[in-house]
């Protein structure tokens, strides 16, 4: 659980953050786990320990292994593990699998490549990027902040794509690399400020107590492949998960890409056995993308069961 | 040194309310997560609410959700548990807590408790 | 909602003994449970946390192992004052759970 996997090229630098997190204000030791010995926080020294942070600056391929990291508050210790691999350069273009970050996919009008880890380095823009080890050039090609900006994409444009940074510590600069696979979806598209197509806003659900009851969260964010789209339910202002009602729970529907292209998203809440108490609370169904955020509110209201019987007399 | 000290307990008929206030002293209040536990007499213990220190988001127990709120005021480093329709089986030691670590999305323990204040819910 | 079951309900031992209580999830909690102690008119006192580590100013005598969904506290040598109720909690998530307890009395 609090074990993470992080790996490197030798002679790049190397930052690795502690997986045990904690408040901002608790020490961090770090530990060689083979041999217990203390990594130390001395700047002078090739490895050495920032807080939360271990720099290999340059990494060597003789540092691979796993480090213990321990985080301690004024009353409570914690440790976490980072299981770390240096490997040696390679001497041709490819790219190894176990090199790679995770890919990501790309449309038209949606195409950021996100340089992986580069949030844990100190580094000044501007990134330099490569595909398939050949320099981007052309005005098609944008380094923008921490990401890659491709416009017009093609389906051309696939591939493995590596950022290269200069990592800089007391005035001292090394290289850091880091690469991904980009697949694109060949379809024209756009993203919008999401559109709430259900519930209605202020909606009324009536549900019967002691039944299952279930509620569609469903909005639409553009057409084609939508970057940061995401609906969720809120109880009272809660997530469901720090909610702690395990009759409440949600559930991803399908994507949906509906006759007139638009892309769409559903959340389905499912309140199993409802109970009173759960007519008093505030479900807000929520839909965000980069454009922004829109709130949509449900009440849930006592349906008295229809007594069958009289709807044939 | 940290100090936790519940107050408002006391007798209320069914379906009354109570306010019950927590007093915290020997630490940063405002950013850890605070707890309401709850002891029936003769029985264990059981979680009632947890409201964060960052956000202030709750959560509450199944047996107690839409009938007691859980908030907090930092300016006065006081918790506060507000109990409406009080029922017979809400009847128990009431105690606060400070769980002194957790992340977003995460739990920890709690490792100081107040003395506990008792509620008694009786016609 | 993770069920915490203690065993035994109670256990009657003698200064000196060992003393073994152990604590069953009804489904993982990876090493996110902890051990209190509770003695008659008094609140909680935290002893073990991530299932094995001694809480600030715990006697060495008190120790926990386990992981996933075993769980045991084990006191290698009773004193007097160790006589009371334990109580297991996970808080790998909402809602918090705690164990029925176990009574450690005199035998």
């Known amino acids: 659980k609090f074990s993470k996997q992080s790996w490197g090229l030798e002679n790049e630098a190397l930052i690795v953050r502690c997986p045990r997190q904690g408040k901002p204000s608790y020490t961090v030791d770090w530990y060689y786990s083979q041999t217990n010995k203390s990594i130390p926080t001395q700047e002078r020294n090739r490895v050495f320990a920032s807080g939360q942070l271990l720099k290999f600056l340059p990494a060597a391929v003789a540092d691979s292994g796993i480090y213990t990291c321990i985080v301690r508050s004024p009353t409570f210790n914690r440790t976490g593990y980072a299981n770390v691999t240096i490997y040696k350069k390679q001497s041709d273009c490819n790219v190894p699998d176990y090199l790679m970050y995770s890919t990501v996919s790309g449309s038209e009008k949606n195409s950021k490549i996100y340089c992986p880890t580069i949030d844990l380095y100190n580094w000044t823009a501007p990134l330099e990027w490569f595909k398939n080890c050949q320099a981007l050039q052309g005005s098609r090609y944008r380094a923008h902040k921490s990401f890659l900006v491709i416009d017009n994409v093609m389906t051309e444009d696939a591939g493995d794509y590596t950022c290269k940074f200069i990592h800089n510590e007391n005035g001292a600069n090394y290289s850091v690399t880091a690469t991904r696979s980009f697949t694109v979806k060949d379809e024209q598209g756009f993203s919008l400020f999401p559109v709430i197509g259900a519930p209605a806003q202020n909606e009324i659900k009536e549900v019967e107590i002691g039944k299952n009851a279930n509620l569609t969260c469903s909005a639409c964010f553009g057409k084609g492949t939508q970057f940061l789209a995401a609906v969720l339910w809120q109880l009272n202002g809660t997530k469901i998960t720090d909610f702690g009602e395990p009759r409440i729970q949600q559930e991803e529907g399908q994507n949906q890409s509906f006759s007139n292209g638009l892309a769409c998203l559903d959340m389905v809440l499912r309140i199993a056995d409802v109970k009173e108490e759960d007519l008093l609370l505030q479900y807000d169904c929520l839909a965000l993308n980069l454009h922004g955020l829109r709130r949509h509110t449900v009440r849930l209201s006592r349906k008295n069961p229809i007594d069958h019987h009289s709807i044939y007399c | 040194e940290v100090q936790l000290l519940e107050s408002g307990g006391g007798l209320v008929q069914p379906g009354g309310s109570l306010r019950l206030s927590c007093a915290a002293s020997g630490f940063t209040f405002s950013i850890y997560d605070m707890i309401w536990v709850r002891q029936a007499p003769g029985k264990g213990l059981e979680w009632v609410s947890t409201i964060r220190g960052e956000g202030g988001g709750t959560s509450y127990a199944d047996s107690v959700k839409g009938r007691f709120t859980i908030s907090r005021d930092n300016s006065k480093n006081t918790l506060y548990l507000q109990m409406n329709s009080l029922r017979a089986e809400d009847t128990a030691v009431y105690y606060c807590a400070r769980d002194p670590w957790s992340t977003e999305g995460s739990f920890f323990v709690l490792d100081y408790w107040g003395q506990g204040t008792l509620v008694t819910v009786s016609s | 909602e993770i069920v915490l079951t203690q065993s035994p309900a109670t256990l009657s031992l003698s200064p000196g003994e060992r003393a073994t209580l152990s604590c069953r999830a009804s489904q993982s909690v990876d090493d996110d449970l902890a051990w209190y102690q509770q003695k008659p008119g008094q609140a909680p006192r935290l002893l073990i946390y991530?299932?094995?580590n001694r809480a600030t100013g715990i006697p060495a005598r008190f120790s926990g192992s386990g992981s996933g969904t075993d769980f045991t506290l084990t006191i290698s040598s009773l004193e007097p004052e160790d006589f009371a109720v334990y109580y297991c909690q996970q808080y790998i998530t909402a809602p918090l759970t705690f164990g029925q307890g176990t009574k450690v009395e005199i035998k």
């Open positions: 991530d299932a094995s």
